[in-house]
Amino acid sequence: MMTGTIETTGNISAEKGGSIILQCHLSSTTAQVTQVNWEQQDQLLAICNADLGWHISPSFKDRVAPGPGLGLTLQSLTVNDTGEYFCIYHTYPDGTYTGRIFLEVLESSVAEHGARFQIP
């Protein structure tokens, strides 16, 4: 039974040209994390593998930094970065848990962070 839950940073906004940290946290399960994938829609941004460490997709190398922890830092944000981001936890023996974050990149300087919320 997949008992775990993923807590994410939820709906967040940030300023164009700035940076943002995407974070997920898996709880309420005894399962062991082997790999975490970060995806934007259908594009792979980065992988954090238990043995191999971090791999950032070549097309994002200049603007994506690993961490903190299993999170991901997006830098030099553009309006085109607005959209859905997914953290996909590959765990033993439960399988995959997926968390969703919606990022809005704003032109103005009034970007505010959304509240944290639970994804079952």
Partner: antibody, heavy 119, light 109 residues
């Protein structure tokens, strides 16, 4: 390369306990779960449980609950499985196997430890 | 507890293709059962071939492939080699425990 090396064969009397070890090398021990599986002579495989090597939390198959204890020594990358109140039906080869969450399952296996229970 | 069933024995000619299946007494096998296939040769350690239905293990030849077929998990060996003669076990995950099948003895003849 990944290796799981188990302790040697044991002969035990009914009612006794046995402790089998599984020493891992070639990877970061605390990044992957460890399973214990047994195979009685001429029989199939039976899963006994697994232990989260990061938290140390074990999960036991219902059949072995109360009789099996799975532990770790992370300083030596070794997993242990202790089975108590042994009976003749526990005569089997006991295997450790690594649990991988990327494509869920057991990817590497130890060579096995024969435990014979006989009076 | 669920019962996992496999063909007791199968024979394939060298270079031929053979499919081993793995069924569940609880109904159709799905990706949630994370079907595993392991190979056992006499006097050798078990070798993990397939994990998570179709994930080939490290160093496992491409002739081994896993899938779901007609409500069962399947292991297909395309272009069987003499060294593929072995016992093959499948394992299915049922919420909180693994159950192994009885094994298939594959003969390459």
């Amino acid at each position: 390369q990944v290796q799981l090396v188990q302790s040697g064969a044991e002969v035990k009397k009914p009612g006794a306990s046995v402790k089998v070890s599984c020493k891992a090398s070639g990877y970061t021990f605390t990044n992957y779960g460890m399973n214990w599986v047994r195979q009685a002579p001429g029989q199939g495989l039976e899963w006994m449980g697994w232990i989260n090597t990061y938290t140390g939390e074990p999960t036991y198959a219902q059949k072995f609950q109360g009789r099996v204890t799975m532990t770790l020594d992370t300083s030596t990358s070794t997993a242990y499985m202790e089975l108590s109140s042994l009976r003749s039906e526990d005569t089997a080869v006991y295997y450790c196997s690594r649990g991988n969450g990327y494509y869920v399952g057991m990817d590497y296996w130890g060579q096995g430890t024969l435990v014979t229970v006989s009076s | 507890q669920a019962v996992v069933t496999q063909e007791p024995s199968l024979t394939v000619s060298p270079g031929g293709t053979v499919t081993l299946t793995c069924g569940s007494s609880t109904g159709a096998v799905t990706t949630s059962n994370h079907a595993n296939w392991v190979q056992q040769k006499p006097g050798q350690a078990f070798r993990g071939l397939i994990r998570g239905t179709n994930g080939r293990g490290s160093g496992v030849p491409a002739r081994f492939s896993g899938s779901l077929l007609g409500g069962k998990a399947a292991l297909t060996i395309s272009g069987a080699q003499p060294e593929d003669e072995a016992e093959y076990y499948c394992a299915l995950w049922f919420s909180n425990h693994w159950v192994f099948g009885g094994g298939t003895k594959l003969t390459v003849l």
